[in-house]
Interface confidence: low
C-alpha cells in the first residue's frame, strides 16, 4: 500500500492522543534506554510502511503484536486516514477478528514495540523552524 | 552495508557534456531525497543540486541552473546528472549525497558516495 | 542569497576545546547541520539539527544554535580530529542547500 495520500495530520492526532499512550503501557516496567532504534523511516509515507510492517507482519519471536490495543487503534486510524487502505487489508482483518488477551510479552516483542515507538517519534517530528 | 557509487567523472573540453550516475545499495532509496554537491580543487564544499524522493520536485544552485538536470530512476535505484554546456568552473569533485526528505529539505547530509572527479579543459 | 561565514582556520592545542563558528542572519532561526572532512575523503556528518550527533560520532562533538551564531564545540580534542569542518543550512526563501566557506581545524 502507498501510504502517500494519507492524512498526516489527523494521524499524527490518533497517535498523540492514544496510540501512544497503549505503546507506553504496553512497555512498562522497560527502560527507556533498554534498546537501541535499527529502524528508522526518512518521510511520513515511509514511516508509515515500516510502522504497518512492525505492527502487523509477524516476525520471528513475536507474532502477537497485530492483536494489541495500540496496533487495533493503528489499523483503524489507517483505514480512516489512508484512502483505500482498508480494502488491501482484508485478509489481515480475519486474523484480528481472533483477538485474545496476551499471554506472555516476550523481550522480542518488546524490543520491537520499542522500535515502533521511535518510528512514530519520526513520524511526528515536529516541524523544527520552517519559515 | 548502505552506499553510493559515483561514477561518469571525466576530463571535458569546454561547452561539452557530460552525465554523472550514481548507484545506491543497502536503503530504501525511493524514500530518500537525494543531492549533487561539488568541491574544486582546494576548495569548500559547494551544493549543486537536489531531487525529491519521488522526482517530484528539483532544486538547483544558480550556478548551474539551465545547464545542469538532476533525475532518479526509483526502479533502479540509480541518480543521475546531466551537465551541458560545461566551464572550466565547473571542474570538480561531485559526489552524490543522501538526505532524509521530510516537509522541505532542511535535513542534513547522512550518507554520502567518494565522489567522482570532473575536469573541463580545453 | 544567504551566506554562512565561517573562520577559515582555527588551532588548539590537544586535550582542550575547540569552538568553530558559522554566522549566518538569524541562523537560529534554521537548523544548522556540520560536517567534518579529512583530506582526500567524502565529508562525514557529526552534528546535525543545530545539536544531535549520529550514533557513531563520540560525544565531544556538540553543537549550539541561536541568534546570528551557531557554533560546533570539539572538547578534549584529539590529533584526530585535525580536519576541514563545513556548516550547512536550507535556505527556504531560495530553496537552496548552503554551505559556510569551511574551517580547519589545526591540533598542535
Known amino acids: 500500500y502507498d501510504f502517500t495520500n494519507c492524512d498526516f495530520e489527523k494521524i499524527k492526532a490518533a497517535y498523540l492522543s492514544t496510540i501512544s499512550k497503549d505503546l507506553i503501557t504496553y512497555m512498562s516496567g522497560t527502560k527507556s534506554t533498554e534498546f537501541n532504534n535499527t529502524v528508522s523511516c526518512s518521510n511520513r509515507p515511509h514511516c508509515l510502511t515500516e510502522i504497518q510492517s512492525l505492527t502487523f507482519n509477524p516476525t520471528a519471536g513475536c507474532a502477537s503484536l497485530a492483536k494489541e490495543m495500540f496496533a487495533m487503534k493503528t489499523k483503524a486510524a489507517l483505514a480512516i486516514w489512508c484512502p483505500g487502505y482498508s480494502e488491501t487489508q482484508i485478509n489481515a482483518t480475519q486474523a484480528m477478528k481472533k483477538r485474545r488477551k496476551r499471554k506472555v510479552t516476550t523481550n522480542k516483542c518488546l524490543e520491537q514495540v520499542s522500535q515502533l515507538q521511535g518510528l512514530w517519534r519520526r513520524f511526528n517530528r515536529p516541524l523544527l523552524k520552517q519559515q | 552495508q548502505m552506499q553510493l557509487v559515483e561514477s561518469g567523472g571525466g576530463v571535458v573540453q569546454p561547452g561539452r557534456s557530460l552525465r554523472l550516475s550514481c548507484a545506491a545499495s543497502g536503503f530504501a532509496f525511493r524514500t530518500y531525497g537525494m543531492h549533487w554537491v561539488r568541491q574544486a580543487p582546494g576548495k569548500g564544499l559547494e551544493w549543486v543540486a537536489v531531487i525529491w524522493y519521488d522526482g517530484s520536485n528539483t532544486h538547483y544552485a544558480d550556478s548551474v541552473k539551465g545547464r545542469f538536470t538532476i533525475t532518479r530512476d526509483n526502479s533502479k535505484n540509480t541518480l543521475n546528472l546531466q551537465m551541458n554546456s560545461l566551464r572550466a568552473e565547473d571542474t570538480a569533485v561531485y559526489y552524490c549525497?543522501?538526505?532524509?526528505?521530510?516537509?522541505?529539505?532542511?535535513?542534513?547530509?547522512?550518507?554520502w558516495g567518494q565522489g567522482t572527479m570532473v575536469t573541463v579543459s580545453s | 542569497s544567504y551566506v554562512l561565514t565561517q573562520p577559515p582556520s582555527v588551532s588548539v592545542a590537544p586535550g582542550q576545546t575547540a569552538r568553530i563558528t558559522c554566522g549566518g542572519n538569524l541562523i537560529g532561526s534554521k537548523l544548522v547541520h556540520w560536517y567534518q572532512q579529512k583530506p582526500g575523503q567524502a565529508p562525514v556528518l557529526v552534528v546535525y539539527d543545530d545539536s544531535d550527533r549520529p550514533s557513531r560520532i563520540p560525544e565531544r562533538f556538540s553543537g549550539s544554535n541561536s541568534g546570528n551564531t551557531a557554533t560546533l564545540t570539539i572538547s578534549r580534542v584529539e590529533a584526530g580530529d585535525e580536519a576541514d569542518y563545513y556548516c550547512?543550512?536550507?535556505?527556504?526563501?531560495?530553496?537552496?542547500?548552503?554551505f559556510g566557506g569551511g574551517t580547519k581545524l589545526t591540533v598542535l
Open positions: 550547512q543550512v536550507w535556505d527556504y526563501s531560495s530553496n537552496h542547500v548552503v
Open positions: 549525497v543522501r538526505a532524509p526528505q521530510w516537509y522541505l529539505s532542511a535535513e542534513a547530509f547522512d550518507l
